[in-house]
């Protein structure tokens, strides 16, 4: 049995993690601050040793090597990473069958559909979330996280893969979207902008936030990421918006304080384990959910996106550190690593709470145009 994360009935707009409603002043993406369609961020970066075909780094589940001990990880991603493999850290999916998939970038050639045809699919991510049009779905229960409070050892690999900064997670972090919808966390990574320019991937009524965290999960129904790619619900991503607040965020500081060590593309370091759940909002009960894709090549569809309604607050200095420390390919700063929002093409975004009712400063009157499609979940 899992224990749902404790809900601390925090008042709307309150809580140490940030505001309850991630809506702000209109900030419609401009041509310059939304990278071109062909430039997904180092999203769904799945753990990897080197940039792998897609997902920046898609972990591969392999049996544990004898040297790393007698652990039985038949269905957990493992890694034989240089440095501190400390144990199975999710390993990169190294098949080079998509040869070009590791050669993509934001805002330039080659066009992403040429890198991976799935990037031209009809149900892509990220998307613009319009709370007024979201379908309230009472069947969407609070998310459950188990084992996300990591001890300092084993240490975790923090890597600049040229598209994002990615933290590879060890086995044992379990997440449930609901009964029978169980996942294991593989890695997390961030998307950001540049000085004075926001860089979240998802937007809310056109408003782009300063940054966004993605925690990528593999369904327990699959042993390997490559088996799950493109399968409905095979992968699930928890996403949260990062906003500027008055205080330093101590959880994020454990990662941000190490970015200088990995300023160079392809570099990595080891960081002590930390409470991964502290990087997410505290309210696990209010979120938006829809089916989309990885936001970087291979842009595989069938990914369940869960976007928290509450935001996470970082200090201005921390947001600056995030956007101004890392370097990407070709002596260019690693900035604006987000993909433009993609059309819904008929998809309905579901909400675990009545988002269309007084949850937005722009909500003139309650409207709920769409009905919940998952009533029986």
């Amino acid at each position: 049995q899992r224990l749902p994360r404790m809900q601390e009935d925090s008042p709307l707009g309150g809580g140490s993690s940030g505001e309850d409603d991630p809506l702000g002043e209109e900030d419609l993406p401009s041509e310059e601050d939304s990278p071109r369609e062909e430039d997904p961020p180092g999203e769904e970066d799945l753990p990897g040793e080197e940039d792998l075909p897609g997902e920046e780094d898609l972990p591969e589940v392999k049996p544990k090597s004898e040297e790393e001990g007698s652990l039985k990880l038949e269905d957990l991603p493992t890694v034989e990473a240089p440095g501190d493999p400390q144990e199975p850290q999710n390993n990169a999916h190294r098949d080079k069958e998509g040869d070009d998939q590791s050669h993509w970038r934001y805002g330039g050639d080659p066009p992403w559909p040429r890198v991976s045809p799935a990037c031209a699919g009809r149900f892509q991510s990220p998307v613009d979330i319009r709370p007024q049009l979201a379908a309230f779905c009472p069947a969407l229960r609070p998310l459950e996280l188990l084992g996300f409070q990591l001890p300092p050892l084993p240490e975790l690999r923090l890597r600049n893969n040229g598209h994002s900064v990615q933290l590879t997670l060890p086995p044992g972090l379990e997440m449930a979207l609901g009964p029978g919808r169980e996942y294991r966390a593989l890695q997390l990574h961030l998307h950001w902008g540049a000085a004075g320019r926001p860089g979240s991937e998802h937007t809310v009524e056109g408003h782009r936030f300063p940054a966004e965290i993605h925690v990528v999960h593999l369904s327990t129904a699959f042993a390997r990421v490559d088996e799950a790619l493109g399968r409905p619900g095979g992968l699930a991503v928890l996403a949260a918006f990062l906003e500027e607040g008055p205080e330093e965020n101590s959880a994020y500081e454990q990662l941000l304080s190490r970015l200088e060590e990995i300023a160079e593309e392809g570099s990595e370091t080891q960081v002590p384990g930390l409470d991964i759940s502290a990087l997410l909002p505290s309210d696990f009960s209010r979120y938006f959910q829809y089916e989309g894709s990885l936001t970087t090549p291979p842009c595989a569809q069938g990914v369940i996106w869960t976007v928290f309604n509450q935001t996470v607050m970082l200090s201005a200095k921390q947001l600056h550190t995030l956007s101004d420390t890392l370097w990407g390919p070709g002596d260019s700063r690693l900035q604006l690593n987000f993909r433009a929002t993609q059309p819904l093409n008929g998809r309905v975004i579901e909400a675990s709470f009545p988002a269309g009712v007084d949850s937005s400063p722009r909500a003139a009157e309650p409207v709920q145009l769409n009905s919940c499609l998952a009533a029986g979940d």
Epitope: Q1, R2, L3, R5, M6, E67, E68, G69, S70, L71, L73, G83, D84, P85, Q86, E87, P88, L145, L146, G147, F148, Q149, L150, P151, P152, L153, P154, E155, P170, P171, G172, Q270, P272, G273, D275
Partner: antibody, heavy 118, light 108 residues
């Protein structure tokens, strides 16, 4: 085969010092965090200290903080525990153990007995 | 720092099932590891992450977890299973690795 062998235990008077060693073999030592765990005679297990693979991060139980120092020599595949200002309550079998996948300890050495007595 | 609770002893007839509990506030949110320590020997990890069994550990050993209790289950108990069993978690509030007091399993 992964092997951990502790040494350096013995009888020591209160207030004195002792250094324990743990020789590791059968795995890439520098890639793993390591721990010291102790067990007083007839009692349960108590975590004492831990160190990251590079040696850059160290952690201590409150009961030994300021008195014990954990270190490692990756060139020699050896883990150390320098114990100063020893007390009678530090009497125990001291085990070294490798940091396991998600926060546990696996495998363990056979242990070395430290007796603090006047 | 918050403690874990275990029964001091569990007695079971050979061939029967032994259940050893480990109680702790919200232990269901933590990763629980179990160790077996036979008399005069070093501990060995028998269950990691609540229910995963390291290779070399018999299938008779399994684990489960609920809100405030984790359980180590030993099916078809054998004489060789007589040992002390300890649960262990990482406590993020005290920043310590914490062991339970241990349970002595006796095959009657």
């Amino acid at each position: 085969e992964v092997q951990l062998v502790e040494s350096g235990g013995g009888v020591v008077q209160p207030g004195r010092s002792l250094r324990l060693s743990c020789a590791a073999s059968g795995f890439t030592f520098s890639s793993y965090g390591m721990h010291w765990v102790r067990q007083a005679p007839g009692k349960g297990l108590e975590w004492v200290s831990a160190i990251s693979g590079s040696g850059g991060s160290t952690y201590y139980a409150d009961s030994v903080k300021g008195r014990f120092t954990i270190s490692r020599d990756n060139a020699k595949n050896t883990l150390y525990l320098q114990m100063n200002s020893l007390r009678a309550e530090d009497t125990a079998v001291y085990y070294c153990a490798r940091a396991a996948v998600t926060g546990g300890f696996d495998p363990w050495g056979q242990g070395t007995l430290v007796t603090v007595s006047s | 720092q918050p403690g874990l609770t275990q029964p001091p002893s569990v007695s079971v007839a050979p061939g029967q099932t032994a259940r050893i509990t480990c109680g702790g506030d919200n232990i269901g949110r933590k990763s629980v590891h179990w160790y077996q320590q036979r008399p005069g020997q070093a501990p060995i990890l028998v269950i990691r992450d609540d229910r995963d069994r390291p290779s070399g550990i018999p299938e008779r050993f399994s684990g489960s977890s609920s809100v405030n209790t984790a359980t180590l289950i030993i099916s078809r108990v054998e004489a060789g299973d007589e040992a002390d069993y300890y649960c262990q978690v990482w406590d993020s509030s005290s920043k310590h690795y914490v062991f339970g007091p241990g349970t002595k399993v006796t095959a009657l």
